[in-house]
Interface confidence: low
């Protein structure tokens, strides 16, 4: 008799793929045409990335540092009208993209939570949650929660409202903290909260250090669902050396949890790479005309359009990874096991029951390395085969689909490999 299939875990929509943050509508759309009507036109692009949710805004009226002139129920007319927002929600729904609204109150000001009137602001947030849930949003994000006194209890209250409306709604909290104790204490009182932090960016970016960061985090948070990002709002390029961008994309998409990206991460957009751009919200490079003030400042290989046409680009890698992440059971909700490999490497397996299994090998080093995979510390349920098929490499030159002998596996500098192999009873 065939072994019984393992029962599938309950899957929420945010478990099924990546979230994509658009913190600045105008910068994302470029050319000054940054309104909700225009964003509706970018949804096909988001579909092509296979992201599951769009973390949008803030969009509400906010007079810098003025509580009285901050209205969490009103969309700033610069972004459009409630009708435009409603149209966006309808279009996103048709394309199976969920919309999460950022309600960080004082987003134009110094202290995102108005340092002096935290309680009245928190009350405003409560009303806003009710209002926007009725309007049809799929969840909320609040950032800089370390600046919110008694953050845990506020978050618990907001999560109750969100989940009380529907278990299918999500609350995301962001913090600049990279301290694991602090992160765990924020998570303790909130069972379904997704927390983005600077935890992974406080790294020496070596294989060993990254492995220990990931395993410590997973151990500390127990069996709860995680999210993976390098910060609560910034671009990957602001935290990573350029040569590790592809490696981190591969890692974020294959760790157990929800990967969270910012607009532009998929093309390697750099903060303030071009003259006159604000650091926190660089203009998205759609095509070579995206930066009209300085002709020639943008080359095709920096843009969405250019990278779409290049199968070896970062964007193509992102699309491939996102596709795998959203359809393979082992990557969707599989178990996670790290194991020993050569110095400078971080290697792990994702597996679920009798489904195809995935092996990830990441070389953080500046030199080519032998993988040196040692499966002795893997449980019997996750043993390694002698060969595995290459799904993708972060570097050009390897043939996708080709079988690789794991004992002889060598990696190029900064190369990451995603390999697949079948379950064997």
């Amino acid at each position: 008799r065939a072994p019984r299939c393992r029962e599938l875990p309950a899957q929420k929509w945010w478990h099924t793929g990546a979230l994509y943050r658009i913190g600045d509508l105008q910068a994302f759309q470029g050319h000054g045409s940054g309104n909700l009507a225009g964003l509706k036109g970018r949804l096909d692009y988001l579909s092509s990335l296979k992201v599951k949710g769009l973390v949008l805004g803030p969009l509400h009226k906010n007079q810098k540092d003025d509580v009285a002139q901050t209205d969490l129920l009103q969309i700033d007319p610069n972004f459009g009208s409630k009708e435009d927002f409603d149209n966006l929600l309808q279009s996103a729904k048709k394309k199976s993209i969920r919309v999460i609204l950022d309600l960080t109150p004082n987003y134009r000001g110094e202290n995102l939570w108005f340092s002096t009137q935290v309680d009245s602001v928190a009350t405003k947030v409560k009303d806003a949650l009710e209002f926007w849930l009725q309007a049809g949003v799929d969840g909320f994000q609040v950032r800089d929660i370390e600046n919110l006194k008694d953050a845990s209890s506020f978050l618990a209250e907001w999560e109750n409202i969100t989940k009380g409306f529907s278990e299918d709604r999500l609350l995301i909290a962001g913090t600049n903290s990279s301290d694991l104790q602090q992160i765990v204490s924020l998570l303790e009182s909130n069972k379904d909260l997704l927390l983005t932090s600077s935890y992974l960016s406080d790294s020496s970016f070596t294989g060993e250090h990254t492995k220990s960061l990931v395993t410590q985090y997973l151990n500390a948070t127990g069996n709860r669902w995680c999210s993976w990002s390098l910060s609560q709002a910034g671009l990957l390029t602001s935290f990573l050396p350029a040569q590790l961008l592809r490696l981190y994309q591969l890692m974020l998409f294959t760790l157990p949890g929800t990967p969270v990206f910012s607009y532009g991460d998929e093309i390697g957009l750099k903060a303030a790479a071009l003259p006159g751009q604000p650091v926190e919200a660089p203009v998205m490079l759609w095509d070579e005309s995206s930066f009209p003030d300085i002709p020639g400042a943008v080359s095709a290989n920096m843009t969405v359009k250019g990278q779409s046409e290049d199968p070896g680009s970062l964007l193509s890698l992102f699309r491939q990874l996102s596709d795998q992440r959203s359809k393979e059971r082992s990557l969707l909700h599989g178990d996670f096991h790290t194991f020993s490999s050569g110095p400078g490497l971080f290697s792990y397996i994702r597996h679920w029951d009798q489904n195809e299994r995935f092996l990830v090998v990441l070389n953080f080093g500046d030199v080519g390395l032998s993988a040196g995979l040692q499966a002795s510390d893997l449980p019997a349920s996750a043993s390694l085969p002698t060969k595995a098929d290459l799904v993708l490499s972060t570097q050009p030159g390897r043939e996708e689909g080709s079988p690789l002998e794991l004992e002889r596996l060598k990696l190029e500098p900064h190369e990451g490999l995603l390999l697949r192999f079948p379950y064997v009873a």
């Epitope: 045409s33 036109g41 096909d44 005309s289 009209p292």
Partner: antibody, heavy 119, light 107 residues
Framework: QVQLQQSGAELVRPGVSVKISCKAS????????MHWVKQSHAKSLEWIGV????????TYNQKFKDKATMTVDKSSSTAYLELARLTSEDSAIYYC????????????WGQGTSVTVSS | DIVMTQSQRFMSTSVGDGVRITCKAS??????VAWYQQKPGQSPKALIN???NRHTGVPDRFTARGSGTDFTLTISNVQSEDLADYFC?????????FGAGTKLELK
């Protein structure tokens, strides 16, 4: 090179419908949305609407909501505009024009299809 | 709807001269204005897809300026092949709207 080839001129009676086509070549059809524009002597250029070639979802100018229906056939890289209950007011040249990722202006236009409504 | 006003329906010029065609939006459209050239019996041709970006292959004697509500298309050193209708288009918000057009003729 990029081409948008529209169907030939139509002479039709009032009250009937007409469906005009716009066949795209020289680029990946689903990378660009398709706009439709009306040009008449009386009203110059008027935007009818835009259709996403990827999903087929549409945004119409309210003025044409009950008059025009935009569709696409991805397999033949063709966009269609159907005009219903024609009157002499609908006599005009109708253009298809492609746009990359919807929020830019149209960059390439078809040669136009002349529709004349006359009894 | 946003109204795009091209106040001059006709403009006269001579070959070699410069000319400025204006377009005014009824509300703030940032820089989301495109310009098209149309010759008799032909379809419109993209000149500027967004102030001040020239479309591929458009000669640099065509320049566009403006943001907010006031926009201009300048043609320096006018050539005989530039005699045509010129339309502005706002693509800031739906419905997209065109100006009525300005016809450039020889004096």
């Amino acid at each position: 090179q990029v081409q948008l080839q529209q169907s030939g001129a139509e002479l039709v009676r009032p009250g009937v419908s007409v469906k005009i086509s716009c066949k795209a070549s020289g680029y990946t059809f689903t990378d660009y949305a398709m706009h439709w524009v009306k040009q008449s002597h009386a009203k110059s250029l008027e935007w009818i609407g835009v259709i996403s070639t990827y999903y087929g979802d549409t945004t119409y100018n309210q003025k044409f909501k009950d008059k025009a229906t935009m569709t696409v056939d991805k397999s033949s890289s063709t966009a269609y505009l159907e005009l219903a209950r024609l009157t002499s007011e609908d006599s005009a040249i109708y253009y298809c024009a492609r746009v990359w990722l919807l929020s830019y202006a149209m960059d390439n236009w078809g040669q136009g299809t002349s529709v004349t409504v006359s009894s | 709807d946003i109204v795009m006003t091209q106040s001059q329906r006709f403009m006269s010029t001579s070959v070699g001269d410069g000319v400025r065609i204006t377009c005014k939006a009824s509300q703030n459209v940032r820089t989301a204005v495109a310009w098209y050239q149309q010759k008799p019996g032909q379809s419109p041709k993209a000149l500027i897809n967004l102030a001040p970006n020239r479309h591929t292959g458009v000669p640099d004697r065509f320049t566009a300026r403006g943001s907010g509500t006031d926009f201009t298309l300048t043609i320096s050193n006018v050539q005989s092949e530039d005699l045509a209708d010129y339309f502005c288009l706002q693509h800031w918000n739906y419905p997209l709207t065109f100006g009525a057009g300005t016809k450039l003729e020889l004096k």
